[in-house]
Interface confidence: low
């Protein structure tokens, strides 16, 4: 099959993949005259990744809670085995109800976008369901997601979140819209509203145009035992145990204290659906108790007390003192003071001595007081806050904060790579990738003080040196290392950082980055010596920036061959002499030649080797660069990119051409092609200019 | 893993009580409702009722009600299912079941109450 | 109550083909207020307790194969296993979760030929 160039520049030809992983296809080139020797193009087929979601990928969530996923709900893998922190998941559509945020990040900032699989395994990836105003009984969210881990291709999965009062709920012992109990004054009595005890969301459990005809019964089980409940005026008895729901609404249940102390009371009772004309269906049911306080009426409100945050290390455990909790109550014993935990943070929990290893929830003030009670922190280091309900089991419950912050228990620098300083400059910025540093997370408050500084040169901010400076400094890019001393190719200097009250040292390296044109090219012929020019190594752009003539020592290499000085002439005396040192001037003049060896002790083929120079130039520090290059055996059909100024002895014998190169003159005209074959016009004439040069 | 871990075998008089034991582990005992669901020998399954381990609130099948108390011990995670006024009727495998909503994801082993004069 | 009705009572199926399973209730286990049935299939094997296969009439619990798959709304619903393996050998119950008493079929009992 014949394919032209402009066929291979337009996309037109395609390879098709079938059976083995490697491969590929012969071909021959022609111009309409002349036409090349065979080729081979190799292709290699890469096996294709695969990523599968497991997991149910349903998620059921308490009202107004936070939930984790877990890998119970959502777990991807790929084929390839990729690391969880590789496939990631794409937060296509967030969700309606609520709300998917990171654990470890600030809980009130924006919607999450992406996560980890990784992020899901640590519990880390959570749902909060925002209450909505409307009752309901059963509410459904969905989230779309893409898994993605380059190279396979993305897969869209979906996450169905079932949100339902059903549940069993630490954090909502009640299946109503509302059990928040009644305060009476003693002796006096209370209407009980929608506002304390509110069972809509059962009714919500009924499809909206039968909803009308449908209402929640209440069935008293156990009546108050220092009161009495009344509907419509009429008191509640064994005879006439229920009232309803639309009765509550209209503001119909009243709650009589009898008098006689201020002691706790309540009633248990069972709500149900009731269908058309008192009908009993099919539904939702909850049986509860309703918490009725008595207060006294001459009694003072506790006064809560400011509040200062509880600091410890994470992985650590603190007790809580009146620091923390503390409120003003001449009318109530320590032990009366109880505090109830509403929301907790993540990065720990509440414990009492005494009572288990698990959180705790509620506690009084003599918890407090005594030292019993302590915070663990056993998430991750940051600041979270306690939001608690107190009350003196008469008044009315006030709410509280605690503040805790987490400090790292260390932090790490991150040094990811050495400053590099261009060497006609001198200077240069630092940045993250110089100094960064991470406890359990990013710090991005840290501060840096110079507890050894350069030899070489100064640490600046804003032109002026400086021996402390911050991490936003850093990443504005404001801190800047100066060399003040021309002598030196790298310099260090040792730094200690501070972050959230913990200190970690580190060594910044400095190395200076050479203003050298480096070209090695392709492979060069084994035995032969070629020139090294400026199209090899070029320094003249430092040479103008500096204004002088820059200067090249030899540090190292060539492990197999030698930097030689070439005669001018071949009437020039002697033959080449072995190099030290060098300026760009001989570069310019072509005076110099590298003698390319063979590698010793092994079999003839392909060899790496390399140059390591140290750099000079006026006013500049030094810098060392290297030039790495590829060798072959000598092919006399291959062009060469660099100009070869002999050739091995026996390729000259071979090819009956004594003539063609000499060892000490300029290159005859099969050994050179001193111009780089550069493909212009795509693929074919990349292949033509090597193939017909 | 989740477990649901039932006391063993009875064999109980007409008349007579029964008391079975259902231990959780691997999971928030708190967190997840407790069913109770019956097999009399060579037949379908029957449900008798919920327990909610966080409040202790109940939910039992008209056909038990009087009969049957569910109760919960969660310094230990453990349920109970105590059947009273037993009839020969009532012999069967009885399983406790943990769910979130209503269909049930683990299931306990089954204990068997023979009831037998 | 809600009374759920299985069909056949017992079906004997070769080894790879389909099995199907029929599930009727009483009324419907629909709730339209999030278009979501609320029927679950089980299998039970003898000396076994029942074992979660499909919840909400089609998803599937984690870990049961995808052979087995639960379709149907309203009142009528199946459960469909495909490329029939020995294991499946066992009998399978409805169940629907939408009210209390939650109610299960009397039970199908699937024979591998």
């Known amino acids: 099959r014949t394919r032209s160039g402009s066929q291979l520049d337009g996309g037109l030809v395609l390879f098709s993949h079938r059976g083995t992983l490697d491969g590929g296809f012969r071909f021959r080139l022609s111009d309409g005259e002349h036409t090349s020797p065979g080729h081979f193009f190799r292709v290699t087929a890469q096996k294709q990744v695969l990523l599968s979601l497991k997991g149910s990928q349903t998620l059921t969530v308490c009202p107004g809670s936070v939930q984790p996923l877990s890998s119970q709900t959502l777990r991807a893998s790929s084929s390839a085995g990729t690391d969880p922190q590789l496939l990631l998941y794409r937060v296509v559509r967030g969700p309606q109800l609520g709300r998917l945020f990171h654990a470890q990040q600030d809980s009130t900032g924006e919607a999450l976008v992406n996560f980890t699989q990784a992020e899901v395994y640590a519990g880390n990836i959570l749902y909060e369901h925002e209450m909505p105003p409307e009752p309901f009984w059963e509410a459904h969210d969905t989230l779309e997601l893409q898994l993605s881990s380059p190279p396979a291709r993305d897969v869209a999965a979906t996450l169905a979140v079932a949100v339902s009062f059903e549940a069993a709920c630490p954090q909502r012992p009640s299946h109503l819209w509302k059990n928040k109990g009644l305060w009476v004054p003693e002796g006096q009595r209370a209407r009980i509203t929608v506002a304390a005890l509110d069972a809509s969301n059962l009714l919500a459990s009924v499809p909206s145009p039968q909803r009308s005809e449908h209402d929640v019964l209440f069935q008293v089980t156990q009546f108050p035992s220092r009161g009495q409940l009344l509907v419509s005026e009429e008191p509640l008895h064994a005879g006439q145990p229920h009232f309803l729901q639309s009765q509550l609404a209209a503001g119909q249940l009243v709650y009589a204290h009898g008098g006689g102390g201020t002691q706790q009371d309540g009633f248990h009772f069972r709500a149900h659906l009731q269908g058309p004309a008192g009908a009993s269906v099919a539904g939702p049911q909850t049986s509860e108790a309703f918490a009725i306080t008595v207060r006294d009426v001459n009694e003072r409100p506790p006064q809560p007390q400011a509040s200062v945050p509880l600091r410890l290390t994470r992985g650590s455990r603190a007790p809580i003192s009146r620091a923390q909790l503390s409120v003003v109550d001449p009318d109530s014993a320590p032990g009366e003071i109880e505090y109830e935990v509403q929301r907790a943070p993540h990065n720990g929990f509440l414990s009492l001595v005494g009572g288990g290893l698990g959180p705790v929830t509620r506690f009084t003030q003599a918890d407090v007081d005594s030292g019993r009670l302590a915070f663990v922190a056993n998430g991750s280091s940051v600041a979270g806050i306690f939001q608690l309900s107190m009350s003196d089991g008469a008044s009315p419950p006030l709410p509280m904060s605690l503040a805790v912050d987490i400090l790292p228990s260390a932090i790490e620098v991150q040094l990811r790579a050495p400053l590099e300083v261009p060497q006609a400059l001198g200077r240069s910025s630092l940045s993250q990738q110089q100094l960064r540093v991470v406890s359990d997370r990013e710090e991005p408050e840290a501060a840096y003080r110079l507890i050894q500084g350069p030899q070489y040169g100064h640490l600046l901010v804003g032109g002026r040196p400086t021996s402390a400076f911050s991490q936003f400094q850093i990443d504005q890019g404001e801190v800047v290392f100066a060399f003040t001393n021309s002598s030196s190719s790298h310099d260090h200097f040792r730094v200690l950082a501070l972050a959230r009250g913990v200190n970690a040292s580190a060594v910044v390296n400095v190395t200076v980055r050479a203003l050298l044109h480096v070209w090695a090219g392709g492979p060069w012929p084994q035995g032969a010596t070629l020139r090294l020019d400026p199209t090899v190594l070029d320094a003249g752009e430092l040479a103008n920036r500096t204004d002088s003539v820059p200067r090249f020592r030899l540090l190292e290499g060539p492990r197999h061959g030698r930097v030689v000085r070439v005669p001018r002439a071949r009437t020039e005396p002697g033959g080449s002499q072995l190099v030290e040192q060098f300026t760009q001037q001989d570069l310019e003049d072509g005076r110099l030649g590298l003698e390319v060896g063979r590698p010793e002790g092994r079999a003839p083929g392909p060899a790496g080797d390399s140059l390591t120079l140290e750099l000079w130039a006026q006013g500049v520090p030094p810098a060392v660069a290297s030039l790495d290059f590829a060798t072959e055996p000598y092919n006399a059909a291959r062009p060469y990119s660099v100009a070869l100024l002999s050739v091995p002895e026996a390729a000259r014998t071979e090819a009956g051409k004594p003539e063609s190169s000499t060892p000490t003159g300029e290159p005859g005209p099969m050994a050179s092609s001193p111009e780089p074959a550069v493909a212009k016009g795509g693929f074919l004439s990349f292949l033509e200019a090597n193939m017909f040069s | 893993q989740v477990q649901l871990v039932q006391s063993g075998a009875e064999v109980k008089r007409p008349g007579a009580s029964m008391k079975v034991s259902c231990k959780a582990s691997?999971?928030?005992?708190?967190?997840?409702?407790i069913h109770w669901v019956r097999q009399a020998p060579g037949q379908g399954l029957e449900w008798m009722g919920w327990?909610?381990?966080?409040?202790?609130?109940?939910n039992y099948a008209q056909k038990f009600q009087g009969r049957v108390t569910m109760t919960r011990d969660t310094s230990t995670s453990t349920v109970y299912m105590e059947l009273s006024s037993l009839r020969s009727e009532d012999t069967a495998v009885y399983y406790c079941?943990?769910?979130?909503?209503?269909?049930?994801?683990?299931w306990g082993q089954g204990t068997l109450v023979t009831v037998s004069s | 109550d809600i009374v759920m009705t299985q069909s056949p009572d017992s079906l004997a199926v070769s080894l790879g083909d389909r099995a199907t399973i029929n599930c009727k209730s009483s009324?419907?286990?629909?709730?339209?207020?999030?278009?979501?049935?609320?029927l679950a299939w089980y299998q039970q094997k003898p000396g076994q307790p029942p074992k979660l296969l499909i919840y909400?009439?089609?998803t599937r619990e984690s870990g049961v194969p995808d052979r087995f798959s639960g379709s149907g709304s309203g009142t009528d619903f199946t459960l469909t296993i495909d490329s029939l393996q020995p294991e499946d050998s066992a009998t399978y119950y409805c169940?629907?979760?939408?009210?209390?008493?939650?109610?299960f079929g009397q039970g199908t009992r699937l024979e591998i030929k």
């Open positions: 691997g999971y928030t005992f708190t967190n997840y409702y």
């Open positions: 909400w009439a089609s």
């Open positions: 079941a943990k769910s979130w909503v209503s269909w049930f994801a683990s």
């Open positions: 327990i909610n381990p966080n409040s202790g609130a109940t």
């Open positions: 009324q419907s286990v629909l709730n339209s207020k999030n278009n979501r049935n609320y």
């Open positions: 169940q629907q979760h939408y009210s209390t008493p939650f109610t």
